[in-house]
Amino acid sequence: EVTLLDSRSVQGELGWIASPLEGGWEEVSIMDEKNTPIRTYQVCNVMEPSQNNWLRTDWITREGAQRVYIEIKFTLRDCNSLPGVMGTCKETFNLYYYESDNDKERFIRENQFVKIDTIAADESFTQVDIGDRIMKLNTEIRDVGPLSKKGFYLAFQDVGACIALVSVRVFYKKA
């Protein structure tokens, strides 16, 4: 495997593009299993209907790979644990991509992104042992291809969930 993006290995802030700029996705540090701060993106607008919060990564080179894999590790808060928000709270988010030769696209319209999948929490967990308790991170992997341009952007669309993106890794498999 060849890694093209690993959010956990980025030093300092990730600085991805959130839309809207306020009230949607927020970049937040949390502690990992080694008590090291890691950058996450979090959103939890479960009281307001019709949420449409976007988060866009920096440009990712494909390095000639025709098919890439996207591994997302995340925590999703159960709507049942949030009182009185059952009508507006969701438990999924959407994953998109946009191919581009331009590594500095300033503005990409929502309708230019191509949907990869709707992501939900399932039984695919990564076990993380921290002291006296076991944490469970949802892990989902999706693939995209064939790709033709020099690179691409990923985007995460929140539609009213309570979620923390803990890790985003993009990689391809060497032939």
């Epitope: 306020e22 009230g23 927020e26 937040v28 949390i30 502690m31 990992d32 299993e33 890691i38 996450t40 979090q42 939890c44 925590t75 808060r77 644990s81 990564t126 993380v128 921290i130 308790r133 944490m135 469970k136 991170l137 923390a164 803990v166």
Partner: nanobody, 119 residues
Framework: QVQLQESGGGLVQPGGSLRLSCAAS????????IYWVRQAPGKQRELVAA???????NYADSVKGRFTISTDDNKNTVYLQMNSLKSEDTAVYYC?????????????WGQGTQVTVSS
């Protein structure tokens, strides 16, 4: 030790105002979402107001335009200003601070403060 302590509840006439306070000790609010949640007698808990780490606020439809949530980071306190109170606002009001851990949720609750709106 993490603690949330609400205060400011009491008996008030319809149309009156109250300001609830929630003081935190053992942690700082800036890492958490802060919720005010209420529970009326015989009813389920209801999320009333929320504020994010960067100060973005949300309100339940039933209190929009009447209630205001705010924080004072220096005092590590969150407030709920309640104006134009109605009898249906009668409930125990709880302060809730929560945040994401790695693969888990950190969730703290206060003991609650009673608000009674009655003439």
């Amino acid at each position: 030790q993490v603690q949330l302590q609400e205060s400011g509840g009491g008996l008030v006439q319809p149309g009156g105002s109250l300001r609830l306070s929630c003081a935190a000790s053992g942690f700082t609010f800036s890492r958490y979402w802060i919720y005010w949640v209420r529970q009326a007698p015989g009813k389920q808990r209801e999320l009333v107001a929320a504020i994010t780490r960067n100060g973005v606020t949300n309100y339940a439809d039933s209190v929009k335009g009447r209630f205001t949530i705010s924080t004072d980071d220096n005092k590590n306190t969150v407030y709920l200003q309640m104006n134009s109170l109605k009898s249906e606002d009668t409930a125990v009001y709880y302060c809730n601070a929560w945040g994401f851990l790695l693969g888990d949720i950190e969730d703290y609750w206060g003991q609650g403060t009673q608000v009674t709106v009655s003439s």
